[in-house]
């Protein structure tokens, strides 16, 4: 978790307001959830670690016509604006599980809130 | 209503230094990546720094050693420092929120004309 | 670099046709199924608006006569029907390779 700052060149993790946002916006999501997030998309499950926030960009990218998570898919690209380059990326996913959008972001909300708490954004 | 309002453009002569700064208001500053693009006097486009919202820095070898981009998330500015400018660097430069790659530079302030010359 | 080439040069469109405006890319800028190609409109005296992001995405405000196409290399940007509103030079911009490039532009004018 020493890089979450952007794994293209690793820096300061993010400010807390900017990691604060973040989980507000998820938390917006999964509480006004009525049908099934995306229609049920999937998309590639993620390590919680380094590179975090480029990995997450990566997966819920994938996700198309679906205006619940662009506002998220925006923010985490603050996160990580420019690409990664193609040696970094191909260790950013877990390629053998797909879960559903609702999922992964309860574990990403679940990860950031666990990050804040514990002060990680200095 | 998304706003960015540049300022400190000036006529600076080669080798000098300046400073560029960009006020942002009406989406939450400190969330999202930004950037300057300048544009030369023959109406080309040029990408000239990012910076993360996590204060990862990013620059083309043009100008990479010679600018500087920084933010203050509390009082919501965008800086541009440069040095040893040269004539090459004549633009009007534009502070942009950059929303990433996969999204581009959806808003842009009207720009701030910095100009090299002896 | 990146290099993008932008054809025509200028172009002009009698009111209530089509414009078509191309963008090559010197490499492909396609990144894991998204093409990170993004099109501007600048109208004399102001700053670059973005139309498209991602080749095809119409951006929020957007009127729907502006559409994107292309993958890898060869881009396209489109609009139909011309209206006197669209004078403008337009620009295509690649998010793939550092340092991110645009292309050269494409000055549209009314016939």
């Known amino acids: 978790l020493t890089c979450l700052g952007g794994f293209a060149s690793p820096g300061p993790v993010p400010p807390s307001t900017a990691l604060r946002e973040l989980i507000e916006e998820l938390v917006n999501i999964t509480q006004n959830q009525k049908a099934p997030l995306c229609n049920g998309s999937m998309v590639w499950s993620i390590n919680l670690t380094a590179g975090m926030y480029c990995a997450a960009l990566e997966s819920l990218i994938n996700v198309s016509g679906c205006s619940a998570i662009e506002k998220t898919q925006r923010m985490l690209s603050g996160f990580c604006p420019h690409k990664v380059s193609a040696g970094q990326f191909s260790s950013l996913h877990v390629r053998d599980t797909k879960i559903e959008v609702a999922q992964f972001v309860k574990d990403l909300l679940l990860h950031l809130k666990k990050l804040f708490r514990e002060g990680q954004f200095n | 209503e998304v706003k960015l309002v540049e300022s400190g453009g000036d006529l600076v002569k080669p080798g000098g230094s300046l400073k560029l700064s960009c006020a942002a208001s009406g989406f939450t500053f400190s969330s999202y990546a930004m950037s300057w693009v300048r544009q030369s006097p023959d109406k080309r486009l040029e990408w000239v720094a990012s910076?993360?919202?996590?204060?990862?820095?990013y620059y083309p070898d043009s100008v990479k050693g010679r600018f500087t981009i920084s933010r203050d998330n509390a009082r919501n500015i965008l800086y541009l420092q440069m040095t040893s400018l040269r004539s090459e660097d004549t633009a009007m430069y534009y502070c942009?929120?950059?929303?990433?790659?996969?999204?581009?530079?959806?808003?842009w302030g009207q720009g701030t004309l910095v100009t090299v010359s002896a | 670099d990146t290099v993008l080439t932008q054809s025509p040069a200028s172009l002009a469109v009698s009111l209530g046709q089509r414009a078509t405006i191309s963008c090559k890319a010197s490499e492909s800028v396609d990144h894991s199924g998204s093409s990170l190609m993004h099109w501007y409109q600048q109208k004399p005296g102001q700053s670059p608006k973005l139309l498209i992001y991602r080749a095809s995405n119409l951006e929020s405000g957007i009127p729907a006569r502006f559409s994107g196409s292309g993958s890898r290399t060869d881009f396209t940007l489109t609009i139909n029907p011309v209206e006197a509103d669209d004078v403008a030079t337009y620009y295509c911009?690649?998010?793939?390779?550092?340092?991110?490039?645009f292309g050269g532009g494409t000055k549209l004018e009314i016939k």
């Open positions: 910076i993360s919202s996590g204060d990862t820095t």
């Open positions: 942009a929120r950059l929303d990433g790659y996969y999204f581009g530079f959806p808003y």
């Open positions: 911009q690649q998010s793939n390779e550092d340092p991110w490039t």
